[in-house]
Structures are given as C-alpha cells and as structure tokens.
Interface confidence: low
C-alpha cells in the first residue's frame, strides 16, 4: 500500500454543501470550506461549500470583505457547518484578510 | 458533488472478460482513490480494488490474479477489467470514490455470466 | 484480512422502536469504521463515517459508538423509510472489508 494508514487524503475536507451550485447534494469535499454571503439584486445569497483547489479558495479567501460580499473559510471537516459570513458594517473597520478557521 | 457514471456489458458467457468505465464528474480526480465494489444478486458489498490518479492499485488478494484497475487521467475516468469470468463473479458493480469512507457512488452495472 | 462480522443478519422492529446493530472486527481497528444504509434496488449511502461522525443531511437519529473491535449502530427511532439493509465498513488496513449486513424490516 503506497500513502501511511488509515487510507485518508488529510488534504480533503468534508463541507456543508447549500445554494444553487450544489445541486441535490448537502455535501462536498475540497481542500478548504467556505461560507459566503453575496447581495443579488437586494436579496441576501447565502452558499456554503467547497474548493477543490487550494489555490483557488486562497485567492477568495484572502479577498477582503465588501458591502456586497463576504466569504469566511476554514479547514477541517464539516467546519462551515456554522459559520455564517456577514458583512461589513458601513464605517466600521476591518482587516485585510479573513479569520481562518482550523477545527 | 461528485456524480459517477459507469457503463460496460450486462451480459457475458464463461471465460470472458468483464469490462466497466466509471466516469468522474465534478470532482478533484487527485483526491480520491477510485473503487469497485460487487454485489453478488441478494448478497453483501466485495471490495475489489482501487486506484489512484498516479495509477498506483491495490486490490482485494481473492480477486488478485484475475483483476486489474486502470486510470485515464485525461478524461477522468477508470476502468475494471475481470479476466476468466464464472457464474460466481453474477453481481451488481458498483464504481465508488473513497476518502473517510465511499460517500460517492456510481448506479450499478448489473453483470450477469451465463452460458 | 480484517473480518467484520454483523449481528443481527435480520430485525423486526415497530416505527418508533429503538433499533440497535453490532459490529465486531476480527482486530483492532481503531476509529476507522463506517456505517451505511442501503436501501432496495439502490447504491449504498454512507450514514456515519469513523464510528460516529454523522455525515450532514443524515437525519440525527442515527448515531454510532465505539472503538477497537466492538462498534454498534442505533437508529433511535425507527421510521418506516429506515426500511434497509445496513452496513459496516473498515478501512484500518487493506483489503476493505464490509460486515455481513443486517437488513431492518417494520414488524
């Protein structure tokens, strides 16, 4: 057997899956999770799911957050179970770059 | 997220070669170790082997000398192949994707080895 | 190879009744054993995955416990859409190998 037992990718995390891109399933895998929240056309969107690539959650999770979106992300499984992202409040300061979750 | 989709002959004579394709879709084919399992009509789960995007297989020693597992990374698929076939190999073929445990199932072929 | 032997091979319980399935493996697995539902005429569907660890969506009535070699598998209370047969599922060592199953019917 090639990887170390048990058989487990420790780079691939279980996520809560809700919203429109995951189809029927409540549930993905990807290397870190993430839970948004997006205005569209003044209704609030909220989405959990996954990135299956590391560098592609690195780049949305490092964006910071605007009046229009947020996105928080996290690493372990079912970690964005509740985490709800918010946005920013108008006048009030905030970092650079998004918390990151370890579980 | 991830659907697979598997397709190969339903019905084969004795000594013929099995042979099924799983497809992948949405899914990161470097995360996971692609799977079969059977189930024989009314009877429990066989793990047969498994494969992982760098070819690397494992497969269950009942089954060794008959089996081989084969990835195309290029269209995100895999293939079991069963040389030698008998009535005992009749069974519903399953193609799954393993982490934690095989959250991701294919529909089931239904093989059936008859003369 | 690591042998999974389930117990019962059948049940019959009423909806509402607390259902309880073991699990023995042949040695120490640690927490790597899965739980899974297989309804008729469909793939199966992992419920729990590392003994206990419910996978999102899967209604909270299911739960699992133990560790080593002795694990067993409850379904609080038994609705009529747990009509199945259920599974156990190690992967502490190669080759993969599932229980016996138990297959749950409404009495």
């Known amino acids: 057997m090639e990887d170390e037992k048990p058989k487990v990718n420790p780079k691939l995390y279980m996520c809560v899956c809700e919203g429109l891109s995951c189809g029927n399933e409540d549930h993905c895998e990807g290397q870190q999770c993430f839970s948004s929240l997006s205005i569209n056309d003044g209704f609030h969107v909220y989405q959990k799911g996954c990135f299956q690539v590391y560098e592609q959650g690195k780049m949305t999770c490092k964006t910071p957050p605007s009046p229009g979106q947020a996105v928080e992300c996290c690493q372990g499984d079912w970690c964005n179970r509740n985490i709800t992202a918010q946005l920013p409040t108008k006048g009030k300061s905030f970092p650079g770059t998004q918390n990151f979750h370890l579980e | 997220q991830v659907q697979l989709q598997q397709w190969g002959a339903g019905l084969l004579k004795p000594s013929e070669t099995l042979s099924l394709t799983c497809a992948v879709y949405?899914?990161?084919?470097?995360?996971?170790?692609w799977n079969w399992i059977r189930q024989p009509p009314g009877k429990g789960l066989e793990w047969l082997g498994e494969i992982n995007h760098r070819g690397s297989t494992n497969y269950n020693p009942s089954l060794t000398s008959r089996v081989t597992i084969s990835v195309d990374t290029s269209k995100n698929q895999f293939s079991l192949k069963l040389t030698s076939v008998t009535a005992a190999d009749t069974a519903i073929y399953y193609c799954?994707?393993?982490?934690?445990?095989?959250?991701?199932w294919g529909q089931g072929t239904l093989v059936t080895v008859s003369s | 190879d690591i042998q999974m032997t389930q117990s019962p091979s059948s049940l019959s319980a009423s909806v509402g009744d607390r259902v309880t399935i073991t699990c023995q493996a042949s040695?120490?697995?640690?927490?790597?054993l899965n739980w899974y539902q297989q309804q008729p005429g469909k793939a199966p569907k992992l419920l729990i995955y590392?003994?206990?660890n419910l996978v999102p969506g899967v209604p909270s009535r299911f739960s699992g416990t133990g560790s080593g070699t002795h694990f067993s598998f409850t379904i609080s209370s038994l609705q009529p859409e747990d009509i199945a047969t259920y599974y156990c599922q190690h992967y502490d060592d190669l080759p993969l190998t599932f229980g016996g199953g138990t297959t749950v019917a409404i009495r």
């Open positions: 040695q120490d697995i640690n927490i790597y």
């Open positions: 949405n899914g990161s084919f470097s995360s996971y170790y």
């Open positions: 590392d003994v206990s």
């Open positions: 799954t994707a393993h982490t934690r445990g095989f959250l991701y």
